[in-house]
Each structure stands twice: as structure tokens, then as C-alpha cells.
């Protein structure tokens, strides 16, 4: 592509499923135009969680993402959400430079497009293309699980990657089951880990200009079944104004496959509790942990009726855990008024 050519996803329609997560490599100075949905009904574009304005050098307008001239700070994750919902129509990452990385090992490589200018680029030392995917350094996984470490990088010339374990070259030859090194995905995969896999894993990314490295620390736990663990303090007591949107968050850790429900406590015939002593609840959301955003409860355009106690309930084959929080809804016209939630802030319980 010449630098004057545009980066464009065609057609300008809601994408097919295989388009939903992509990486696009864009040359500096190149214009970008990406489409999402049909014209007026097009989705809203967000960069790193912030909605793009309809005007400016980088803009989201009538379903289009338009960048006049691609700059290094334009690199990052862009989402297109359907209007009036949280449905993701496009999920893509724009990368500066001419080296492709993968956002998902299981993707069809054909879904990647190299959109960079193929003319001579200045040499560049390796750099991490997705540091947000490398935020977690300390890992502890139950024996038998699969572990995947990734160090997505780029540079010019395209860097090579090699792996060390405890400072020594690591090819997995002494490991039962071996390892999978997917250089095009910058990843190391170990299936069915055992205690002897504990150690410090280092990815070393090098080219003629320089090198970078990153350490992952891996612990392998002997399996000890437990009910789900919920992060303390979540969900958190929240105060909102009528008409606003609220997100309640619940973080769940479970070895065994957990099942999560969001409940709202309700009153029936003037009572909050049934004859069995259990509270009356309404199930708002239910799914397993693999479902998208099950750990978040979205309440849109809240009204006074939405005020009350909400519970995140997580269960697995061993038992149940739940934590609750209060939502206080303030009238629109007097945002200075505050209502005190009950004494107990976020409280939690465990049941076998």
C-alpha cells in the first residue's frame, strides 16, 4: 500500500463473526477508514473504553472510524458497539509498523491484514505491541491445566523470540507432553502442567537493533477443591442518579467450573424473607464464567425501583459463595442529597 492509500474494511456492514476480533497493522501517516454497521444505524466507536467524538483527527461518525493520518498514539484497541446496547460489532487492534502479531492463537491467519507501507522503514529495536496482555506476571494454576504465555512484539527487522526457563534455553524436550512454540503468535503453550513446570519463564525478543525480555513466574498447585472465591469488596455499594447507568462488578476465582448468578432482593407481600428463612430474590443474569462479561451487571437508565440489595452468587461442584451490595438511587433534581446504605458495606458468605 502506498502511504496515501486508505485502510478500509469492506463492506461497510455489520461484520461477519470471523471479523469480530482482528489486528490491523497501519503505516504511520496512513489514512484509516473503518466501517461498522449501516450509515445512520452504524455503531459507536470507542478507543480504550472512551467513545470517539464525531469530529477531530480521530473520529467516530455514522458508524465509521476515521483517522486522517495514523500516528503512534493512535495504536490501540478499538471497539464498535451497536447503538443502544453492549453488543460488540467490531473488536480490533491497530498496530504501528509492519510486523503482524496475533490477538488469538485460534484465529484464522487469513483474517489478519498487513496494512503497512512495504517501502523501506527505519530500523527499530523490538517493542511490545500488547503490553496490556502481559500485565499479569505471577501465575498460579492447578495441576493439569494448560498454560499459555505470550510476548507479542514487533520491530524492524522482524524480531525473533526464544524462551528460557530459570535462565536456561527452553525447548521442552525434557517435559512430558512437550511444549508448543508458536512464533507467529509469540506464544509458549504447556498443556497439562505438573509441579516440575514451576519456574521463571523468560521470553527473549531480539533483532539486529536490540533485545527485550519479560519474565513470567509460574507456580503449579496440587488440586485442592474449594468453593468459588469472590474478591473482597465486590460488588461495591453504589450511589447513582435517576436515569444514569450503573455497573456492578463481581470477580470470581474458581478451580472447578463456576456458575454465576446476579440476584436482586425483592419484597413480596411486605416481606423480604420467605417462610424458609431465605430472602426473596429475582434472578437478573445467569451464566458460567466463560460467558462474556458475566461478572458485570449492567443496569441501564436506573429508576428509584432499581434501588436495593444486589447479590453476586457463584457456585461450583464444591459449594456456593455470594457477596452483596446496595444500590442507592438519588432523585435527578437534587444530586446533593445522599442516602446512607445499611451499615454493612459489601458483605460475603460461604455455603457448602
Amino acid at each position: 500500500l502506498e502511504a496515501s492509500e486508505e485502510v478500509e474494511l469492506e463492506p461497510c456492514l455489520a461484520p461477519s463473526l470471523e471479523q469480530q476480533e482482528q489486528e490491523l497493522t497501519v503505516a504511520l501517516g496512513q489514512p484509516v477508514r473503518l466501517c461498522c454497521g449501516r450509515a445512520e444505524r452504524g455503531g459507536h466507536w470507542y478507543k480504550e473504553g472512551s467513545r470517539l467524538a464525531p469530529a477531530g483527527r480521530v473520529r467516530g461518525w455514522r458508524g465509521r472510524l476515521e483517522i486522517a493520518s495514523f500516528l503512534p498514539e493512535d495504536a490501540g484497541r478499538y471497539l464498535c458497539l451497536a447503538r443502544g446496547s453492549m453488543i460488540v460489532l467490531q473488536n480490533l487492534t491497530l498496530i504501528t509498523g509492519d510486523s503482524l502479531t496475533s490477538s488469538n492463537d485460534d484465529e484464522d491467519p487469513k483474517s489478519h491484514r498487513d496494512l503497512s507501507n512495504r517501502h523501506s522503514y527505519p530500523q527499530q529495536a523490538p517493542y511490545w505491541t500488547h503490553p496490556q496482555r502481559m500485565e499479569k506476571k505471577l501465575h498460579a494454576v492447578p495441576a493439569g491445566n494448560t498454560v499459555k504465555f505470550r510476548c507479542p512484539a514487533a520491530g524492524n527487522p522482524t524480531p525473533t523470540i526464544r524462551w528460557l526457563k530459570d535462565g536456561q534455553a527452553f525447548h521442552g524436550e525434557n517435559r512430558i507432553g512437550g511444549i508448543r512454540l508458536r512464533h507467529q503468535h509469540w506464544s509458549l503453550v504447556m498443556e497439562s502442567v505438573v509441579p516440575s513446570d514451576r519456574g521463571t519463564y523468560t521470553c527473549l525478543v531480539e533483532n539486529a537493533v536490540g533485545s527485550i525480555r519479560y519474565n513470567y513466574l509460574l507456580d503449579v498447585l496440587e488440586r485442592s477443591p474449594h468453593r468459588p472465591i469472590l474478591q473482597a469488596g465486590l460488588p461495591a455499594n453504589t450511589t447513582a442518579v435517576v436515569g444514569s447507568d450503573v455497573e456492578l462488578l463481581c470477580k470470581v476465582y474458581s478451580d472447578a467450573q463456576p456458575h454465576i448468578q446476579w440476584l436482586k432482593h425483592i419484597v413480596i407481600n411486605g416481606s423480604s424473607f420467605g417462610a424458609d428463612g431465605f430472602p426473596y430474590v429475582q434472578v437478573l443474569k445467569t451464566a458460567d464464567i466463560n460467558s462474556s462479561e458475566v461478572e458485570v451487571l449492567y443496569l441501564r437508565n436506573v429508576s428509584a425501583e432499581d434501588a436495593g440489595e444486589y447479590t453476586c452468587l457463584a457456585g461450583n461442584s464444591i459449594g456456593l459463595s455470594y457477596q452483596s451490595a446496595w444500590l442507592t438511587v438519588l432523585p435527578e433534581e437534587d444530586p446533593t442529597w445522599t442516602a446512607a446504605a445499611p451499615e454493612a458495606a459489601s458483605h460475603h458468605h460461604h455455603h457448602h
Epitope: 503490553p131 500485565e135 505471577l138 498460579a140 514451576r198 527485550i212 507456580d219 503449579v220 496440587e222 474449594h226
Partner: antibody
């Protein structure tokens, strides 16, 4: 309440040994990476060591490698630091701390510290 | 001891904005999340902020952070007397020398 409580500090001669303990409560100790951080009088913080949840992986700062040993007893919810061949420069308040995945591996809970003085 | 570099002191009057810098290298801040700790006089350190402005419960949003390349900074807006403390940046380190490094520490003084 989530809490860490260190003990075992005191005065010891150069070349001597000391064993620090850290009792954890209010959380599932066996699920967390734990560490020791020290602070010499009037100085800044220095990371000393970290240990994995199972105890099978330990990492040390160069300044204590070969002299200090970090360990844990998950059945007793207790973290230890065995300090041998102590030197004057090991004089510090020693804090035990929990590293949390929820907080992107930061040390989110700290004990109140125990003072170790190495002097003849 | 391998450290991140911070200014030894910073000060401001109540209500002012104070910024603390933290300079590291590609092996620590350049590749890793930055953590910030606050140590009030005579007490143990406490986690103040981490990552992209994530705070433990109870930490006011007057505290904010930013990161660029191998440097980071902590900003305290609307400075209050209770903010007088030592502040430390920290990061995991991928060099062969250290695994977790703290900054040299910055003493924040609230004037008048």
C-alpha cells in the same frame, strides 16, 4: 479482617541468625504469592524475596541470596524468613506483604513490620 | 539495590496539585505495570494505586497516575494535610539483576 502480623525480630550479632514469622488471617493464604520487603532506618523500601502459593518457587534479591530463605506453611497460614550470616546492613524493619492478582501483582496487604538490628 | 529514581521531596499548599516522577528502564517500567505505595509517618506502606489508575477501595480519586515509556508519574490534585507522607513507585523487573524494584521515595510535604 485481612491481616498480616510479623514477629521474631530483635537484636542479633553479625554472623548470627534469626527467623521471622508472619501470621496471615482473613484470606485464603494458600492462594497468594507472598513476599518480604525491608526498610533500613531512615531509608527507602527494598524488596527482599517472594514465594509462590505452593511454596515451590522462591525468588531473592541479590543482596540476600544464599543467606536468606523464604518459606511458608499453608496449613498454619504462616510465612517465614530464615536469615543467616546476618550483616550490619541487614538492619531494617522487615515487612511481610501479600501480592495480589486482583491488584495486578502489587503488594496490596502489608504487616506492621518487625525490627531486626544487627550489631555487636 | 536496584532502584527507580524519584525526586527526594515535593511540596505544595492545601488544594494545590503535586506531581512525583518515577524514572526506570525498559526492563522494569518499560515492560511492567507500575505500583505506587504511600507510607504515612510511623506506619507500614500501603498500596495506593496501580496499573491504569486502579485504586484499592478507600483511596480517593485525587490520586492519579500516568506512564510513558520507561517513566511514570503520580499526581495528587487538591492536596490535603493527610497526604503528607512518603510515596514510592515500584515495578517488577525483567533484568537479570532484580525481580521487584522500588523507587527511591519522595517525601511530600503540605505547607502552611
Amino acid at each position: 479482617e485481612v491481616q498480616l502480623l510479623e514477629s521474631g525480630g530483635g537484636l542479633v550479632q553479625p554472623g548470627g541468625s534469626l527467623r521471622l514469622s508472619c501470621a496471615a488471617s482473613g484470606f485464603t493464604f494458600s492462594h497468594y504469592w507472598m513476599g518480604w520487603v525491608r526498610q533500613a532506618p531512615g531509608k527507602g523500601l527494598e524488596w527482599v524475596s517472594v514465594i509462590s502459593p505452593s511454596g515451590g518457587l522462591t525468588i531473592y534479591a541479590d543482596s540476600v541470596k544464599g543467606r536468606f530463605t523464604i518459606s511458608r506453611d499453608n496449613s498454619k497460614n504462616t510465612l517465614y524468613l530464615q536469615m543467616n550470616s546476618l550483616r550490619a546492613e541487614d538492619t531494617a524493619v522487615y515487612y511481610c506483604a501479600r501480592s495480589s492478582g486482583w491488584a495486578l501483582d502489587a503488594f496490596d496487604i502489608w504487616g506492621q513490620g518487625t525490627m531486626v538490628t544487627v550489631s555487636s | 539495590q536496584y532502584e527507580l529514581t524519584q525526586p527526594p521531596s515535593a511540596s505544595g499548599t492545601p488544594g494545590q496539585r503535586v506531581t512525583i516522577s518515577c524514572s526506570g528502564s525498559s526492563s522494569n517500567i518499560g515492560s511492567n505495570i507500575v505500583h505506587w505505595y504511600q507510607q504515612l509517618p510511623g506506619t507500614a506502606p500501603k498500596l495506593l494505586i496501580y496499573g491504569n489508575n486502579q485504586r484499592p477501595s478507600g483511596v480517593p480519586d485525587r490520586f492519579s497516575v500516568s506512564k510513558s515509556g520507561s517513566s511514570a508519574s503520580l499526581a495528587i490534585s487538591g492536596l490535603q494535610s493527610e497526604d503528607e507522607a512518603d510515596y514510592y513507585c515500584a515495578s517488577w523487573d525483567d533484568s537479570l539483576k532484580a525481580f521487584y524494584v522500588f523507587g527511591t521515595g519522595t517525601k511530600v510535604t503540605v505547607l502552611g
